[in-house]
């Protein structure tokens, strides 16, 4: 485990206040834990429970964050893992607010150049393998939130300290208010609403829905892009096929993309990534004599 | 106990490419950046860069991108140091090293170096 | 990138006297400053973090202090196991960089 890590400040969960809200009952059903004379029940929820070694790792991933982003020395570890601890912890975890995740925003304030935001939608890894590459350019998951809490799952349980490694809440089948959607909702709408200049988007050309409404990307990013900041969003539409030669940026949902964004005074581009594979070569080596032609 | 042990010495031929190991134990692998750091014979500390096992991004200082490339396995604990196009000013001691939270920002940790002489 | 210059290059001294040396960064590294000690063929142990904090186990005869620009890196009462080259790191902008080193040498 993280012993060194911990030699000098131990995670603490009796400290700080905890909120707690009205317990409205969920889809879950209550499963008996504990041993002892007197049962205690936990809800079983649909969805798998708190990633193993939760608390541990969102410590350490702030401080693998803080290392290598000198510009962020300021933040304390200990009191973003206290802050994202108090968010959900003794919380009904169906029952979670963007309020409870302010105090966490609030340490976690962190701004991206004008002209350099990568949005994305369900082509999460080519957007990141892109940013490590054209490393002045920042998906949600390139700042310290998005870093910390990435492909990570985590709840708690209406008035017990305890976090619940054996279930939390599915978005469908039990709540939308849950711990990790209602993070991402957070602070998806932070970073939205923080970009300026020409906002970058990367969407899956291989869905039968390139442009979603019902992702992140459609329901949250794109409602909290500010006109004012922001002047153009430009799409990128990544194929998967090698024979691939259609036109995306002429598909229905790119075309109702472009309606909703230029119905918010924001002007629309939208371009085709034939070779994602050979997009990424021309990012690495843009000298590259195959990287005069298309891409 | 941390420990960082890396791989013995290497003798490359000049262009050929060596790759060195450093195998970490006493923390789990993910949850710390592994540096690595150059030392030339009778000469100072020059830092390569880092890797992030968790992830596999990396960050290697200008001077050493065209020759240095990191790379780590989470399922060994080990991190990788791989030199390309080897010339006789790459030899020199390649050392792996972390920080430890609390401690600022320095490195505590370190592993014993592994010597890699170019020659022909 | 951040230059360290660090002086002198070397000092020849005796055992229980006062030794001083310095690290000039090329521009403000607010207190990222560490002090590492090198003996001869092995790796470097790191002695100061953060300007002037004793890392752990580190006797208390060596010292750092200094911020911004200017660094110092005292062993107050020198013993013969102190013999070695020390090094200042800045870690405050990537690329982290070292000074070139003062090699303490036996009068």
């Known amino acids: 485990g993280l012993n060194d890590i911990f030699e000098a400040q131990k995670i603490e969960w009796h400290e700080g206040s905890h909120h707690h809200h009205h317990h409205h009952h969920g889809s879950g059903s209550l499963v008996p834990r504990g041993s002892g004379s007197l049962p205690r029940w936990r809800q079983q929820w649909s969805g798998s429970g708190t990633t193993s070694r939760f608390p541990e790792t969102v410590l350490a991933r702030c401080v693998k964050y803080t290392e290598v982003h000198p510009e962020m020395r300021h933040v304390d570890c200990q009191s973003v893992w206290d802050a994202f601890k108090g968010a959900f912890i003794s919380k009904y975890p169906c029952n979670i607010t963007e309020e409870d995740y302010q105090p966490l925003v609030k340490l976690g304030t962190q701004t991206v150049p004008c002209n350099k935001t990568l949005l994305w939608s369900r082509i999460k890894d080519l957007a990141h393998q892109f940013t490590q590459v054209q490393r002045d350019m920042f998906t949600l998951e390139d700042m310290l939130l998005g870093y910390l809490a990435d492909d990570l799952t985590w709840c708690g349980e209406f008035n017990t300290f305890e976090i619940n490694y054996q279930s939390c809440p599915d978005w469908r089948k039990d709540c939308s208010n849950n711990p990790v959607s209602v993070f991402w909702k957070t602070v998806s709408r932070r970073f939205a609403e923080t970009a300026c200049g020409v906002v970058h988007v990367m969407l899956n050309g291989s869905r039968s829905k390139i442009f979603d409404k019902n992702s992140t990307f459609g329901s949250v990013e794109v409602h909290n892009l500010q006109p004012e900041k922001v002047q153009a969003l430009e799409a990128w539409v990544i194929h998967g096929g090698r024979e691939d030669s259609r036109d995306l940026c002429q598909d229905p949902t790119i075309k109702e993309l472009e309606s909703i964004i230029s119905k918010r005074n924001i002007r629309f581009f939208c371009k085709n990534i034939y070779r994602p594979d050979k997009f990424l070569q021309c990012v690495k080596n843009p000298e590259d004599s195959s990287c005069l032609s298309g891409i | 106990e941390v420990q960082l042990q890396q791989s013995g010495p290497e003798v490359g031929r000049p262009g050929s490419s060596v790759k060195i190991s450093c195998k970490a134990s006493g923390y789990t692998f993910t949850d710390s950046v592994m540096n690595w750091v150059k030392q030339s014979p009778g000469q100072g500390l020059e830092w390569i860069g880092w890797?992030?096992?968790?992830?596999?991004?990396?960050d290697v200082a200008e001077k050493f991108k065209k020759k240095a490339t990191l790379t780590a396995d989470s399922s060994s604990s080990t991190a990788y140091i791989y030199l390309s196009g080897l010339t006789s000013e790459d030899t020199a001691t390649y050392f792996c090293?972390?920080?430890?939270?609390?401690?600022?920002?320095?490195?505590?940790?370190w592993g014993q170096g592994s010597l890699v002489t170019v020659s022909s | 990138d951040i230059v360290m210059t660090q002086s002198p290059t070397s000092i020849s001294i005796s055992v229980g006297e006062r030794v001083t040396m310095n690290c000039k960064a090329s521009?403000?590294?607010?207190?990222?400053v560490d002090w590492y000690q090198q003996k001869t063929g092995q790796s470097p142990k790191l002695l100061i973090y953060k300007a002037s904090n004793r890392y752990t186990g580190v006797p208390d005869r060596f010292t750092g202090s200094g911020s911004g620009t200017d660094f110092t890196f005292t062993i107050s009462n020198m013993q013969a196991e102190d013999l070695a080259v020390y090094y200042c790191m800045q870690s405050n902008t990537h690329p982290r960089t070292f000074g070139g080193g003062t090699k303490l040498e036996l009068k």
């Open positions: 890797i992030d096992p968790e992830y596999g991004r990396t």
């Open positions: 521009q403000n590294v607010d207190s990222d």
């Open positions: 090293a972390r920080t430890k939270y609390n401690s600022g920002y320095g490195f505590p940790y």
